[in-house]
C-alpha cells in the first residue's frame, strides 16, 4: 500500500500556503482527485509529488494515490481543507444524476472542518428541503440525501454560518432519474380491423413509461406514419399516444401496422392488420365433418366458425327434421367470440334419443344476408333380431329380420341341444350371409334387412340361431323346432332401447 | 488493465434523443471520473461534459441544455443523451477516463452516430 | 473558455526527421493540465504526453513535451512511419476541457 506524506488524515492550510503532498510506493504511483488548479505533478520512480505554491479553496478535496501495478489495489488518501474565510464551499459539480431510491451525494465540499456544526442544506432561493428528505453531512464529501426520490429533483445550495451569518454556495442540480424497468409499455387498438371501402377507421397507437425519455412511432408497412403526438402524465407514467383516424377507407390504406417505443433500455413494438373489403362477407365453416354419426345415448357437439364483418345481426340453430318439430334448446347453444370477427357458436346435445337424428342448420345474419351450415346427424343402433318359422313356395324357412345402423351382418348357427345361444362346442354348422335382402333403408333410420334359411328337416334336438352385428354391437334370436310346433328364444339380455 | 466500450443506435433521427452507454471492464467505475468528447467527420475533439462515479457531473456550457448524464456503478458503466439532435450532431462519440492529474488516459475505440430522417 | 490554437496545421516530413507542433493557448494553462494526444485514421486518441512533459505509459521517449503559461510544444525526435498521425493538445485545468484542432503530421 503506497505510504502518503505527511501522514495525516486530513490537513487544514490557508489560502496562498504551499502545500507538498508526496506518496511512495513499492513500484510507480498516481495521484487522483478533484479537478482543481496550480497543483504540479512530479513523478520520479516510486513516488509522485503534488505540490502548489498557491492553494486556493478550490484545492480543497481528497487526494487519493495509488499503485496501479498492486494486484490488490490498494490506496492511500489524504484530504486537505485550504480554509478561505470568504469561501466556506468548494463545489466539485454543477449537476448530480442518480436513481430513485439511491443516496445522492451533492459534493459541497467544506473547506473549513470548524464550520461543520452550522452547516445545512436548503433548496435555492432559501426554500427549506422538502418534507420527508433524509440527509447528512460529511466535511469531506458533502450532503447526502438517502433514497433520493424523483420528487426530490430540484436545485440545492449548501449553507454555512460564518461570523452569525449563513453563506450559501453556487448552486447543484439534482436529478433523480426514474428506475425504468424495460422499453415502454404498448398498446395498439384495435388488434385487427376489417373495414369497408369507404368507412372511416381509427387505430391507436400509445405508451407509457417512468420516464419521459421515450419515443414513440407508427408506421405502415414499414413506413413510419406523421402523426401529431398527444402527451400526458397520471398514475406516474408519461404516456404519449398517436391517434390515425382515417374518413374514407381505400385498399391503399390496408396492411400491417406496426406501434413502436424505444427508450434506453431497448424497444418494444406491437402489430395488428388492417382489411379493407369491397362488401360484407360472412362466411361459415366448421373443423368437423358436416355428416355426423353417433351411438344413440351418446353426445354430441356441433361447432361452427363465423367470419363476419359487420357483425352478426342475428344467428340461430335449427332443427329440420324428419322426426319431430322440436327445436334445439336455447340453453344448449353457446357463442364465444375468438376475436372481432370471428366467433364460434356450439350446439351441445347431450344423451341423443332416436327422434333426434336429423339435420341440424346452424343460420347467420349480417348485412352481407343469410348463411346456413347444415349438419346431418344418423344414429348408430346395436342390431335387434327376430326369427320366425314359415313355408316359401313349400319349403320350410327360417326367417330372421335384424334392424340396425350401420347396416347388420347377418350369420346362421346350428348346434346340438336345446340353448338360448350357441356356444363353440355345440355348433355343428356356421353360414354366412353376405347380401342379406335390404327390407327398409331411410335417411337418418334403422336399415332392416331379412335373411332366410331353407330348412328341408328340422332336427327336433337341435338349435337354430341368428347373429347380427355391426359397428355398435350385435343381436341374436335362437330357435328351437318342437314337436308340436316351433319354439323361439330371445337372447336374455335384450338389447338396450332407448 | 481498464478498457471501455461505447455502444447505442447509430441512427438517429432529427429531433430525438440520442443515448449512447460507456461500459468499463477490467477495473472499477468507483473513485474516477468519465468524460464524452465526440468528433464530427473530419473535424477536431469536443469534450461534451464528465461525470463522477457518483453522478456528480461538469457540462461543457455549449451543450449543457441538452445533455443528461448517468451513472450506474452496479454495471460499471455510464451514459450520455443528448436531446432534441440536429445533423450537426453527426459524430464519433468516445468515451474516455478522465483524470485530474494526467488528462484522458484510457478510451473507448467510438461510435458512429448519424443524424438524419 | 481557453482556446488552443495549433500550428502547423499540415506538417510534411519524412521519416527520420524532427517534427516541432506548437499549441498556443488563449490565456494561461498550468503547465500541470495540458496533455497532447495521437490519433491515427479509424482509431481513437491516444494519451502521449499530460502535465506538459510527462510521457503517458508505453509511449516511446522519441515523444517530448515543454512549454509553460500559453506556449506549449511537441517534439518528435525522429520520425518513425507509425507516427504519422494527428496530433491534439488539451487543457484540462479550467471547465470546459478544450482540445486543439490538430496538427496533421504527413510523410513528405
Known amino acids: 500500500i503506497p505510504v502518503i506524506e505527511p501522514s495525516v488524515p486530513e490537513l487544514v492550510v490557508k489560502p496562498g500556503a504551499t502545500v507538498t503532498l508526496r506518496c511512495v510506493g513499492n513500484g510507480s504511483v498516481e495521484w487522483d482527485g478533484p479537478p482543481s488548479p496550480h497543483w504540479t505533478l512530479y513523478s520520479d520512480g516510486s513516488s509522485s509529488i503534488l505540490s502548489t505554491n498557491n492553494a486556493t479553496f478550490q484545492n480543497t478535496g481528497t487526494y487519493r494515490c495509488t499503485e496501479p501495478g498492486d494486484p490488490l489495489g490498494g490506496s492511500a488518501a489524504i484530504h486537505l481543507y485550504v480554509k478561505d474565510p470568504a469561501r466556506p464551499w468548494n463545489v466539485l459539480a454543477q449537476e448530480v444524476v442518480v436513481f430513485e431510491d439511491q443516496d445522492a451525494l451533492l459534493p459541497c465540499l467544506l473547506t473549513d472542518p470548524v464550520l461543520e456544526a452550522g452547516v445545512s442544506l436548503v433548496r435555492v432561493r432559501g426554500r427549506p428541503l422538502m418534507r420527508h428528505t433524509n440527509y447528512s453531512f460529511s466535511p469531506w464529501h458533502g450532503f447526502t440525501i438517502h433514497r433520493a426520490k424523483f420528487i426530490q429533483s430540484q436545485d440545492y445550495q449548501c449553507s454555512a454560518l460564518m461570523g452569525g451569518r449563513k453563506v450559501m454556495s453556487i448552486s447543484i442540480r439534482l436529478k433523480v432519474q426514474k428506475v425504468i424497468p424495460g422499453p415502454p409499455a404498448l398498446t395498439l387498438v384495435p388488434a385487427e380491423l376489417v373495414r369497408i371501402r369507404g368507412e372511416a377507421a381509427q387505430i391507436v397507437c400509445s405508451a407509457s413509461s417512468v420516464d419521459v425519455n421515450f419515443d414513440v412511432f407508427l408506421q405502415h408497412n414499414n413506413t413510419k406514419l406523421a402523426i401529431p403526438q398527444q402527451s400526458d402524465f397520471h398514475n406516474n407514467r408519461y404516456q404519449k399516444v398517436l391517434t390515425l383516424n382515417l374518413d374514407q377507407v381505400d385498399f391503399q390504406h390496408a396492411g400491417n401496422y406496426s406501434c413502436v417505443a424505444s427508450n434506453v433500455q431497448g424497444k418494444h413494438s406491437t402489430s395488428m392488420f388492417f382489411r379493407v373489403v369491397e362488401s360484407a362477407y360472412l362466411n361459415l365453416s366448421s373443423e368437423q365433418n358436416l355428416i355426423q354419426e353417433v351411438t344413440v345415448g351418446e353426445g354430441l357437439n356441433l361447432k361452427v366458425m363465423v367470419e363476419a364483418y359487420p357483425g352478426l345481426q342475428g344467428f340461430n340453430w335449427t332443427y329440420l327434421g324428419p322426426f319431430s318439430d322440436h327445436q334445439p334448446e336455447p340453453k344448449l347453444a353457446n357463442a364465444t367470440t375468438k376475436d372481432t370477427y370471428r366467433h364460434t357458436f356450439t350446439l351441445s346435445l347431450p344423451r341423443l334419443k332416436p327422434s333426434e337424428a336429423g339435420r341440424y342448420s346452424f343460420l347467420a345474419r349480417n348485412p352481407g344476408g343469410w348463411r346456413a351450415l347444415t349438419f346431418e346427424l344418423t344414429l348408430r343402433y346395436p342390431p335387434e333380431v327376430s326369427v320366425i318359422w314359415t313355408f316359401i313356395n313349400g319349403s320350410g324357412t327360417l326367417l330372421c329380420a335384424a334392424s340396425g345402423y350401420p347396416q347388420p351382418n347377418v350369420t346362421w348357427l346350428q348346434c346340438s341341444g336345446h340353448t338360448d345361444r350357441c356356444d363353440e362346442a355345440q355348433v355343428l354348422q356356421v353360414w354366412d350371409d353376405p347380401y342379406p335382402e335390404v327390407l327398409s333403408q331411410e335417411p337418418f333410420h334403422k336399415v332392416t334387412v331379412q335373411s332366410l334359411l331353407t330348412v328341408e328337416t328340422l332336427e327336433h334336438n337341435q338349435t337354430y340361431e341368428c347373429r347380427a352385428h355391426n359397428s355398435v354391437g350385435s343381436g341374436s334370436w335362437a330357435f328351437i323346432p318342437i314337436s308340436a310346433g316351433a319354439h323361439t328364444h330371445p337372447p336374455d339380455e335384450f338389447l338396450f332401447t332407448p | 488493465q481498464v478498457q471501455l466500450q461505447e455502444s447505442g443506435p447509430g441512427l438517429v433521427k432529427p429531433s430525438e434523443t440520442l443515448s449512447l452507454t460507456c461500459t468499463v471492464s477490467?477495473?472499477?467505475?468507483?473513485?474516477?471520473?468519465w468524460s464524452w468528447i465526440r468528433q464530427p467527420a473530419g473535424k477536431g475533439l469536443e469534450w461534451i461534459g464528465r461525470?463522477?462515479?457518483?453522478?456528480?457531473?461538469n457540462y461543457n456550457p455549449s451543450l449543457k441544455s441538452r445533455v443528461t448524464m448517468s451513472v450506474d456503478t452496479s454495471k460499471n458503466q455510464f451514459s450520455l443523451k443528448l436531446s432534441s439532435v440536429t445533423a450537426a450532431d453527426t459524430a464519433v462519440f468516445y468515451c474516455?477516463?478522465?483524470?485530474?492529474?494526467?488528462?484522458?488516459?484510457?478510451w473507448g475505440q467510438g461510435t458512429t452516430v448519424t443524424v438524419s430522417s | 473558455e481557453i482556446v488552443l490554437t495549433q500550428s502547423p496545421g499540415t506538417l510534411s516530413l519524412s521519416p527520420g526527421e524532427r517534427a516541432t507542433l506548437s499549441c498556443r493557448a488563449s490565456?494561461?494553462?498550468?503547465?500541470?493540465?495540458l496533455a497532447w494526444y495521437q490519433q491515427k485514421p479509424g482509431q481513437a486518441p491516444r494519451l502521449l504526453i499530460y502535465?506538459?512533459?510527462s510521457r503517458a505509459t508505453g509511449i516511446p521517449d522519441r515523444f517530448s513535451g515543454s512549454g509553460s503559461g500559453t506556449d506549449f510544444t511537441l517534439t518528435i525526435s525522429r520520425l518513425e512511419p507509425e507516427d504519422f498521425a494527428v496530433y491534439y493538445c488539451?487543457?484540462?485545468?479550467?471547465?470546459?476541457?478544450?482540445f486543439g484542432g490538430g496538427t496533421k503530421v504527413e510523410i513528405k
Open positions: 474516455a477516463r478522465d483524470r485530474a492529474f494526467y488528462g484522458m488516459d484510457v
Open positions: 477490467g477495473g472499477s467505475i468507483s473513485s474516477y471520473y
Open positions: 461525470i463522477y462515479s457518483s453522478g456528480s457531473i
Open positions: 490565456q494561461s494553462v498550468s503547465s500541470s493540465y
Open positions: 502535465g506538459a512533459s
Open positions: 488539451q487543457q484540462y485545468g479550467n471547465s470546459p476541457l478544450t
